[in-house]
Amino acid sequence: QPDAINAAVTCCYNFTNRKISVQRLASYRRITSSKCPKEAVIFKTIVAKEICADPKQKWVQDSMDHLDKQTQTPKT
């Protein structure tokens, strides 16, 4: 789903139709470029595969919150 329209910008044109288990997600980045047709979130899974998701969906927002908290909590 991410398409590199140039070296700097990656766009999403479709979103996953699935709620993905947060345990499978490693990180995310937001796509907000005006060069892209829609705002998106690209999740990277624990096996480094990328998935475009709709930032308006609650599970996407919850997953981003979860990943943010993981990042803020130092591992002992």
């Epitope: 789903q1 044109y13 139709n17 699935r18 288990s21 345990q23 499978r24 595969k49 990328e50």
Partner: antibody, heavy 122, light 107 residues
Framework: EVQLVQSGGGLVQPGGSLRLSCAAS????????MSWVRQAPGKGLEWLAN????????YYVDSVKGRFTISRDNAKNSLYLQMNSLRAEDTAVYFC???????????????WGRGTLVTVSS | AIQLTQSPSSLSASVGDRVILTCRAS??????LAWYQQKPGKAPKLLIY???SLESGVPSRFSGSGSGPDFTLTISSLQPEDFATYFC?????????FGGGTKVEIK
């Protein structure tokens, strides 16, 4: 080891029923969609059905809708295919497969069972 | 349902040859296309997903390209273990569908 181990195939008469099982190990089964795919002798692959992580959402191909039921038991790390009203044309090797999300769509398969043969004949 | 047509249905090639397999979709599937290798009596093995992404552990001599209706799988230098049947699969929409396969045989 990450694997899917299948069981339950065999010979069944037309109109009969059979239940296939697929036991997952080496990964967190409850985090993944799962699918069944079949292959008639000497033929190509046909996707049959898939099921969401908690079993709440399921999709089927028209040729098995109403006759086959996909289910799962996450406590047992197991996937099932209940096949009823079997026909000769259902004779095939049946594979279970782990079903992943892609970039522009959902539903490709990165891990497969070895397959189990179902023969429908009188 | 989206139909996938693979060509050729079979081909003969020699070790070291560059081999190109094609898969044409009856309607647009964006980049939602995967390629699998299957050997007799075995389960299929994922090679390529998202039209061009190489699955982990798959040799770099395999590559995928294309979008819209036409996709290709290229084997840059055919190895003895590559003689098998190759299937494409679309995951753009339900029902998920496979192509009829291309059998790569030894010349």
């Amino acid at each position: 080891e990450v694997q899917l181990v299948q069981s339950g195939g065999g010979l069944v008469q037309p109109g009969g029923s059979l239940r296939l099982s697929c036991a997952a190990s080496g990964f967190t089964f409850s985090h993944y969609w799962m699918s069944w795919v079949r292959q008639a002798p000497g033929k190509g692959l046909e996707w049959l059905a898939n099921i969401e992580q908690d079993g709440s959402e399921k999709y089927y191909v028209d040729s098995v809708k109403g006759r086959f039921t996909i289910s799962r038991d996450n406590a047992k790390n197991s996937l099932y295919l209940q096949m009823n009203s079997l026909r000769a044309e259902d004779t095939a090797v049946y594979f279970c497969a782990r079903d992943l999300e892609g970039l522009h769509g959902d539903g490709y398969f990165d891990l497969w069972g070895r397959g189990t043969l179902v023969t429908v004949s009188s | 349902a989206i139909q996938l047509t693979q060509s050729p249905s079979s081909l003969s090639a020699s070790v070291g040859d560059r081999v190109i397999l094609t898969c044409r979709a009856s309607q647009g599937v964006s980049s939602a296309l995967a390629w699998y290798q299957q050997k007799p009596g075995k389960a299929p093995k994922l090679l390529i997903y998202d039209a061009s992404s190489l699955e982990s552990g798959v040799p770099s001599r395999f590559s995928g390209s294309g979008s819209g209706p036409d996709f290709t799988l290229t084997i840059s230098s055919l190895q003895p273990e590559d003689f098998a049947t190759y299937f494409c699969q679309q995951f753009n929409s339900y029902p998920l569908t496979f192509g009829g396969g291309t059998k790569v045989e030894i010349k």
